[in-house]
Amino acid sequence: MRRGPRSLRGRDAPAPTPCVPAECFDLLVRHCVACGLLRTPRPKPAGASSPAPRTALQPQESVGAGAGEAALPLPGLL
C-alpha cells in the first residue's frame, strides 16, 4: 500500500525552490505542482499573468496571511 511522502522527522528540508509561474509549491509532497491541482489559491506575484488558481476563496477569507504578515511574492516560497 502506498504510504506517500515521508515526514521530515525533525530534519530540516532545503528551502523550497521557487516554482515557475504556472506552478505552486505543494507543502505535503514538497515540490512544485500545477497550481490548478491544489484547493487553495496562492497569491500571484505582482504583474504575473499566469492563470488564476482553480478555486474560489473560502467565504470572507483572505488568501494572504493574517494581520501583520505579508504574503511572500513567489508561490514557490509559501
Partner: antibody, heavy 118, light 113 residues
Framework: EVQLVESGGGLVQPGGSLRLSCAAS????????WNWVRQAPGKGLEWVGY???????YYNPSLKSRFTISRDTSKNTFYLQMNSLRAEDTAVYYC????????????WGQGTLVTVSS | DIQMTQSPSSLSASVGDRVTITCRSS???????????LHWYQQKPGKAPKLLIY???NRFSGVPSRFSGSGSGTDFTLTISSLQPEDFATYYC??????????FGQGTKVEIK
C-alpha cells in the same frame, strides 16, 4: 462553499469491515487533499489519512494498514474502508478538507459513529 | 511523530474570565520555509471541530477578536480575553509542520465554574 457529508457508520462486530463515504459538494475532490479524522468517545482527535488530487494516499502509521482510502471522482466522493476492526476503533469518523496553503482543516463533515462491539 | 501536549486538560472558569491554554510540541514547529503551522480548533459536544486560529496567531474568518494565539518554536498559547457563554467547549492545538502525520493535542475542556 464546500460541504462534506459522511455516511456508512454503524455497529460492526470485532474483526468485521465497514466502508464510510464522504460526499463532497461545492468543490471537486480532483483537487487538494481529502482527509479522515477520528475521535474515540471522550477522547481527542486522531488523523487517519488522506487521499490527494493524484489519488495517492497516506495513512497514520498507527493504523497498521488496516484502513484504505479511495475515491470515486464521478460521484465526487471519497471512502474509508476499515478492515479487521477492533473495539478501539469505536469512534466518530469525520471527513475534512485541507487548506493546502496553510495546512489546516477548513471544512469538516458532521461525523459518523462507528461502534465495534460483539 | 510530533507529540503535542496541552495544559491544563480541563479548567473551570466564569463568564468574563481571561482563559489561557498552553500547547507544547516535542520539537520545533518552525518549517524550513520560516512559517509555523500551529493551529487551534474549538469543538462543542456532538459537533465537528471548527478552526479558530491558524499559523499561531491568525484568526480564521468569523472568529471573534477575544480569541488570540501566540508563541513560537515549541511553546504556544491560546487566550480568550473575556470568556463568553458560547466559548465553553474543548480546544485542540494541532501541528502541520512535520506532516504527515498531522497531530493534535489531547484537548483542553473549558467548563463553567
Amino acid at each position: 462553499e464546500v460541504q462534506l457529508v459522511e455516511s456508512g457508520g454503524g455497529l460492526v462486530q470485532p474483526g468485521g469491515s465497514l466502508r464510510l463515504s464522504c460526499a463532497a459538494s461545492g468543490d471537486s475532490i480532483n483537487f487538494g487533499y481529502w482527509n479522515w479524522v477520528r475521535q474515540a468517545p471522550g477522547k481527542g482527535l486522531e488523523w487517519v489519512g488522506y487521499i490527494s488530487y493524484s489519488g495517492s494516499t497516506y495513512y497514520n502509521p498507527s493504523l497498521k494498514s488496516r484502513f484504505t482510502i479511495s475515491r470515486d471522482t464521478s460521484k465526487n466522493t471519497f471512502y474509508l474502508q476499515m478492515n479487521s476492526l477492533r473495539a478501539e476503533d469505536t469512534a466518530v469518523y469525520y471527513c475534512a478538507a485541507l487548506n493546502d496553503l496553510f495546512l489546516y482543516f477548513d471544512v469538516w463533515g458532521q461525523g459518523t459513529l462507528v461502534t465495534v462491539s460483539s | 511523530d510530533i507529540q503535542m501536549t496541552q495544559s491544563p486538560s480541563s479548567l473551570s472558569a466564569s463568564v468574563g474570565d481571561r482563559v489561557t491554554i498552553t500547547c507544547r510540541s516535542s520539537q520545533s514547529l518552525v518549517h524550513s520555509n520560516g512559517n509555523t503551522y500551529l493551529h487551534w480548533y474549538q469543538q462543542k459536544p456532538g459537533k465537528a471541530p471548527k478552526l479558530l486560529i491558524y499559523k499561531v496567531s491568525n484568526r480564521f474568518s468569523g472568529v471573534p477578536s477575544r480569541f488570540s494565539g501566540s508563541g513560537s518554536g515549541t511553546d504556544f498559547t491560546l487566550t480568550i480575553s473575556s470568556l463568553q457563554p458560547e466559548d465553553f467547549a474543548t480546544y485542540y492545538c494541532s501541528q502541520s509542520t512535520h506532516v504527515p502525520p498531522f497531530t493534535f493535542g489531547q484537548g483542553t475542556k473549558v467548563e463553567i465554574k
